[in-house]
């Protein structure tokens, strides 16, 4: 019998017959170790590899370059998969990106991009996107013309300021741009008027901090 190929992502997991959302182990090209990820098998047909999740403020996202590179948190809750893994996964084949958002009033929205990949570390994990659709604003709250990733100890933005220090968290900041899903978590009632919160400008404006976010990717040919 031909040996089964290891899963490259959650799409492979889904297509192998595992259609329940949960934690699975994937084997990413050019990565020495397998990686545990959360697979969302419910949203829009399933097969989504979750690369970021916020839900309760239990995890500190104000971290440095190395931690954002290799990832932190636990896929069962809040986590950042790691830029090195995101780069490696999105180098395997063409991917789309879906971002699920929820505000403190219970309203849900999403933004979806037809193409998503990031550059390598030398390229500061530069963001590449195309084809925005969704309900979280007519315009994209992610920089479509490309932005480098910045953290509190790596200032790669297009601002005279230091976006990652001022707004907290690691993100593809411009100057500083219309989003930051890795900002400070603020609870209900404290989430208004926050420059450094979890922001998606074209959904809730420049200073509203969101309740939950999920960033997930899936192959274009799924």
């Amino acid at each position: 019998r031909e040996e089964e190929k290891p899963f490259r992502d959650c799409a492979d997991v889904y297509q192998a017959g595992f259609n329940k959302s949960g934690i699975y182990t994937i084997y990413i090209n050019n990565m020495p170790e397998p990686k545990k990820v959360f697979c969302n098998m419910d949203v829009n047909g399933g097969g989504w590899t979750v690369i970021q999740h916020r839900e309760d403020g239990s995890l500190d996202f104000q971290r440095g370059w190395k931690e954002y590179k290799m990832g932190f948190g636990n896929p069962s809750g809040e986590y950042w998969l790691g830029n090195e893994f995101i780069f490696a996964i999105t180098s395997q084949r063409q991917y789309m990106l879906r971002i699920e958002l929820m505000d403190w009033e219970g309203n849900r929205a999403y933004s979806q991009y037809d193409r998503f990949h990031i550059g390598n570390e030398k390229q500061n994990y530069r963001l590449y996107l195309k084809g925005h659709t969704g309900t979280a604003g007519k315009q994209s709250s992610l920089i479509l013309h490309g932005a480098d990733f910045s953290t509190k100890d790596a200032d790669n933005d297009n601002c005279m300021c230091k976006c990652a220090l001022m707004l907290t968290g690691g993100w593809w900041f411009d100057a500083c741009g219309p989003s930051n899903l890795n900002g400070m978590f603020y609870t209900a009632g404290q989430n208004h008027g926050k420059l450094n919160g979890i922001k998606w400008h074209y959904f809730k404006g420049p200073s509203y901090s969101l309740r939950s976010t999920t960033m997930m990717i899936r192959p274009l040919d799924f």
Epitope: M160, G193, K194, H201
Partner: antibody, heavy 122, light 112 residues
């Protein structure tokens, strides 16, 4: 490189009009709020007017309200200040200035034009 | 309007020595978003102003680390740890917490 290049200054008689322009380059102009700030000869800085990135929000200093009009053309990457009913006390170097941060999150002036002198004299 | 009061108005300094400029506001500048909207600008002779410090204590890119800003509420300070000849000019504080934005009257730093 961010650049703000100003034009339109000059000598004008009291009661007359003048239009200042500020041509922006090196950044996504339509994402930034813009300001006019002036400086009378030998004096300090005075904020004059503000326009949001889309042009939907506009503010004026009391000293120019009703006489000056700020506008922008995002397609042309340009900012304007139409100055009517000019007075001697409007004599100043006028600077256009860009918000430090985009998306109308205001934390001050990140970039300034070179300034243009407006002299109101009979 | 918020009144910004700087002191001293004139500051003669020997190169290599420290310098300090005070800026007081007539009302607290601590904004509801948790920041003090207080900036420091330097206008060198014959030039446009340039941003030094934003949000009270954050140094703008390209500004030497000998410049630092501190303070909260109504009292703010700009410090230069070791003055250099290129630091001459007029220093302005500016508040943006309360509309309209207002500037201090300026502090002229000159080399002794």
């Amino acid at each position: 490189e961010v650049q703000l290049v100003q034009s339109g200054g000059g000598v004008v008689q009291p009661g007359r009009s003048l239009r200042l322009s500020c041509a922006a380059s090196g950044f996504t102009f339509s994402s930034y709020g813009m300001h006019w700030v002036r400086q009378a000869p030998g004096k300090g800085l005075e904020w004059v007017s503000y326009i949001s990135s889309s042009g939907s929000t506009i503010y004026y200093a009391d000293s120019v309200k009703g006489r000056f009009t700020i506008s922008r053309d995002n397609a042309k990457n340009s900012l304007y200040l139409q100055m009517n009913s000019l007075r001697a006390e409007d004599t100043a170097v006028y600077y256009c200035a860009r918000d430090l941060l985009d998306y109308d999150i205001w934390t001050g002036y990140g970039y300034w034009g070179q300034g243009t002198l407006v002299t109101v004299s009979s | 309007d918020i009144v910004m009061t700087q002191s001293p108005l004139s500051l003669p300094v020997t190169p290599g020595e420290p310098a300090s400029i005070s800026c007081r506001s007539s009302q607290s500048l601590l904004h509801s978003v948790g920041y003090n909207y207080l900036d420091w600008y330097l206008q060198k002779p014959g030039q446009s102003p340039q941003l030094l410090i934003y949000l009270g204590s954050n140094r703008a890119s390209g500004v030497p680390d000998r410049f630092s800003g501190s303070g909260s509420g109504t009292d703010f300070t700009l410090k230069i740890s070791r003055v250099e000849a290129e630091d001459v000019g007029v220093y302005y504080c500016m508040q943006g917490t309360h509309w309209p934005p207002t500037f201090g009257q300026g502090t002229k730093l000159e080399i002794k």
